[in-house]
């Protein structure tokens, strides 16, 4: 094995390199010293490093490592951030289109129900948007609220337009009757099933993308331990102390050091793999009633069908509601 | 039969073309994202190697630094010597991940559990019936003859063609629309969003 070349007799080269790291500081010895105070770059002979230099090298090594890590994850981070933003915006546009389709359906088929219908439809789709973004709203409650709100308007405007103003305090009864008489048939249940399934999947898809960003951000900004800093210093900078400026670390040695430094980070690997594969499975299943685009853009049609169902049964419903929403049953038996 | 929004605003010829062309839908966008993500599936296990290959490492040189001395690149000492009589690498590994890493692992475990639950094929048989038939049978109220069978394929009349929506530059804002005007009202930000869908890397 060849003997190490003698260190630079004046430590000049080391000084000029170190000046780039720490301009203006006089920490580099003029000539090689024994270096008995060194803790990382333990010398086998005279050295051009001081304790202060060693500390600076450690700091620099850890900074280098952080930068390398950030550049390693830059492409992945950009991919997820950009897609999360694109999908969020796309979902909002779908919701907006779905709202407009539904409003157009009311405007063209049931003009007498507007503007109240617009208001209820608007509230429903606002809740849809909030749900997708993670708000703590129950989808069944959203759908129930839509139909509970619509029915009194349908009853008073379409089914019983001659109702005197004095009878308009029956709105609350009509809301209750809507569920108890199942006035819309099974359409609300159908919509609940489709909307809740598609929105749940959409919401978790966005949550997963946002968590992906959080994972990258976390590993991106890791602070490496002192031990790791010492290993990196020994690998990248201790050769300088011997005046070996152009020498590079051995490949195998670098891998061993990196594995040591990144032991914690590498533990994420198993869960990261599972994350991508689980996300793929979710995406593969996002069709038909699991596809919010498909479900929401078709809602106007299902709502229209549900109103037609009410109209078809209007005669029977009006009679039953006349009884149920009377203030007292006794009126009818006097 | 209802006027449907596409009957009002979308030229039938355009509609037919849009249906047969390969559109960039949200669904194809999602699949594209997954394909790109899959190329990063080994991201964390490959990190040590990635960082070594992106930092100065002896590749073509005969000699390299092993942490203590200059050695020949293929000698036993190239990987081993630098670790001798130093702090224990095994100890470093044994410390376990930092609290922030443990936390993020817990979050990953949780989302993976959720993702798996949502993707479970069990229960999809029921969904299939609901999807195709409209309703569970036997839940029809009093009059069996009034039991609805759902609207079949006609039920969802708007296919998921977001690019085609974008290209039509059409945003029917009934709230804003004056009177009964049936004009398409383009919204710049919406259009650009969908054209940008293709530019994400």
């Amino acid at each position: 094995q060849p003997p190490p070349p003698p260190p630079d007799a004046t430590c000049h080269q080391v000084r000029s390199f170190f000046q780039r790291l720490q301009p203006g500081l006089k920490w580099v010895p003029e000539t090689p010293v024994p270096g008995s105070d060194l803790q990382v770059c333990l010398p086998k002979g005279p050295t051009c490093c001081s304790r202060k230099m060693e500390e600076k090298y450690q700091l620099t090594a850890r900074l280098n490592m952080e930068q390398l890590l950030q550049s390693a994850s830059m492409e992945l981070k950009f991919l997820i951030i950009q897609n999360a933003a694109v999908f969020q915006e796309a979902f909002e546009i779908v919701v907006r289109h779905a709202k407009n389709y539904t409003n157009a359906m009311f405007k063209n088929n049931y003009p007498s129900l507007t503007p109240q219908a617009f208001e209820f439809v608007g509230e429903f789709f606002t809740d849809v948007s909030l749900y997708i973004l993670g708000s703590d709203i129950n989808v069944d409650d959203m759908v129930n609220e839509l139909f509970d709100s619509l029915f009194p308007v349908i009853y008073t405007q379409l089914m019983n337009p001659g109702l005197p103003d004095s009878a308009l305090d029956i709105n609350e009864c009509l809301r209750g009757a809507r569920r108890d008489l199942k006035v819309f048939g099974n359409f609300p249940k159908l919509i609940m099933t489709q909307v809740s399934k598609s929105l749940q999947v959409t919401r978790i898809f966005l949550q997963a993308l946002n968590l992906g960003i959080e994972v990258i951000n976390t590993t991106d900004h890791l602070k490496f331990s002192k031990d790791c800093g010492r290993m990196l210093t020994r690998m990248w900078y201790c050769s300088y102390c011997q005046g070996l400026m152009m020498v590079k670390p051995c490949g195998g040695y670098c891998n061993v050091v990196m594995q040591g430094c990144m032991a914690g980070v590498v533990e994420i690997d198993k869960y990261w793999r599972e994350y991508i594969l689980s996300l793929e499975e979710l995406v593969n299943g996002m069709y038909r009633i699991y596809d919010m685009e498909n479900v929401l853009l078709g809602l106007f049609s299902t709502i229209h069908d549900s109103i037609q169902y009410v109209q078809k049964n209007a005669g029977k419903l009006t009679t039953t509601i006349g009884k149920l929403c009377a203030h007292s049953q006794q009126r009818q038996y006097r | 039969s209802a006027y449907y929004p596409e009957d009002l605003f979308i030229d039938k010829k355009v509609l037919k073309v849009a249906h047969v062309e390969h559109e960039e839908t949200l669904s194809s966008r999602r699949r594209e994202l997954i394909q790109k993500l899959k190329s990063f599936i080994s991201f964390y296990s490959a990190l040590p190697g990635y960082i070594c290959s992106h930092s100065p490492v002896a590749e073509n040189d005969t000699l390299c630094w092993n942490g203590q001395e200059l050695v020949e690149r293929y000698s036993q000492k190239a990987a081993r010597n630098g670790m001798k009589n130093q702090f224990n690498l095994h100890e470093l590994k044994m410390k376990g991940p930092e609290p922030v890493v443990s936390q993020i692992i817990d979050k990953l475990k949780h989302i993976n559990q959720l993702l798996r639950t949502m993707s479970m094929p069990k229960g999809r048989v029921l969904d299939k019936n609901l999807d195709e038939e409209g309703f569970e049978s036997g839940d029809c109220g009093d009059d069996e003859d009034e039991c609805i069978g759902g609207s079949g394929d006609g039920m969802i009349k708007v296919k998921n063609q977001l690019r085609f929506l974008a290209e039509l530059a059409y945003d029917l804002d009934v709230d804003d629309a004056p009177g009964n005007s049936q004009q398409a009202t383009p919204k710049d930000n919406e259009i650009s969003t969908f054209h940008n869908l293709g530019n994400v890397h």
Partner: antibody, heavy 117, light 108 residues
Framework: QVQLKQSGAELVRPGASVKLSCKAS????????INWVKQRPGQGLEWIAR????????YYNEKFKGKATLTAEKSSSTAYMQFSSLTSEDSAVYFC??????????WGQGTSVTVSS | QIVLTQSPAIMSASLGERVTMTCTAS???????LHWYQQKPGSSPKLWIY???NLASGVPARFSGSGSGTSYSLTISSMEAEDAATYYC?????????FGGGTKLEIK
């Protein structure tokens, strides 16, 4: 005229269940709610739950969820209330009452339930 | 839940006397959902006054009801022997539907 006829008095052991019935006549059974109300000896009235026989929809007082179960049989115009895991606290007279959305108009004669070992 | 407080809990009145009993709700109740029931020992309750002021079938005209929001009352313009009973106010507005503790009216 409207009548609600309730089943006879019950003497039951603690931990057991009891099923009370309320047979309606004089009106269309499926058009009105049937409510159940509890009255302990010398005490006031406490609403338990209601059912709409037309659809089977039920609404419970949170306090009685898991304790009371309401059902209705359209063919016989009869409403039922099953009361489970009985304790001495459940000893009371139970009334059924039919109602519109607003008012409990007609009441059954009541069924006395005594829980005793 | 809405708590209904009736006062007085027990009262006695002479025949021909005007009687008023009150029912106070812990939060507002719509007048459409506030009712009064009469119950005599060993009998089931009977609807007496519905939606605050409407007399149920067969109830004598000497009875009247009034009120709004959280304060309601039942009045007998001239007490008669058959009026001795317990009267319950009841809100059928917000679940769980509740009854007042009752006002027991006795003959003096």
């Amino acid at each position: 005229q409207v009548q609600l006829k309730q089943s006879g008095a019950e003497l039951v052991r603690p931990g057991a269940s009891v099923k009370l019935s309320c047979k309606a006549s004089g009106y269309t059974f499926t058009d009105y709610y049937i409510n159940w109300v509890k009255q302990r000896p010398g005490q006031g009235l406490e609403w338990i739950a209601r059912i709409y026989p037309g659809s089977g929809n039920t609404y419970y007082n949170e306090k009685f969820k898991g304790k009371a179960t309401l059902t209705a049989e359209k063919s016989s115009s009869t409403a039922y209330m099953q009361f489970s895991s009985l304790t001495s606290e459940d000893s009371a007279v139970y009334f059924c009452a039919c109602s519109t959305y607003y008012t409990m108009d007609y009441w059954g004669q009541g069924t006395s339930v005594t829980v005793s070992s | 839940q809405i708590v209904l407080t009736q006062s007085p809990a027990i009262m006695s009145a002479s025949l021909g006397e005007r009687v008023t009993m009150t029912c106070t709700a812990s939060s507002g109740v719509s007048s459409s959902y506030l009712h009064w029931y009469q119950q005599k020992p060993g009998s089931s309750p009977k609807l007496w006054i519905y939606t605050t002021s409407n007399l149920a079938s067969g109830v004598p005209a000497r009875f009247s009801g009034s009120g709004s929001g959280t304060s309601y009352s039942l009045t007998i313009s001239s007490m008669e022997a058959e009026d001795a009973a317990t009267y319950y106010c009841h809100q059928y507005h917000r679940s769980p539907y509740t009854f007042g503790g009752g006002t027991k009216l006795e003959i003096k």
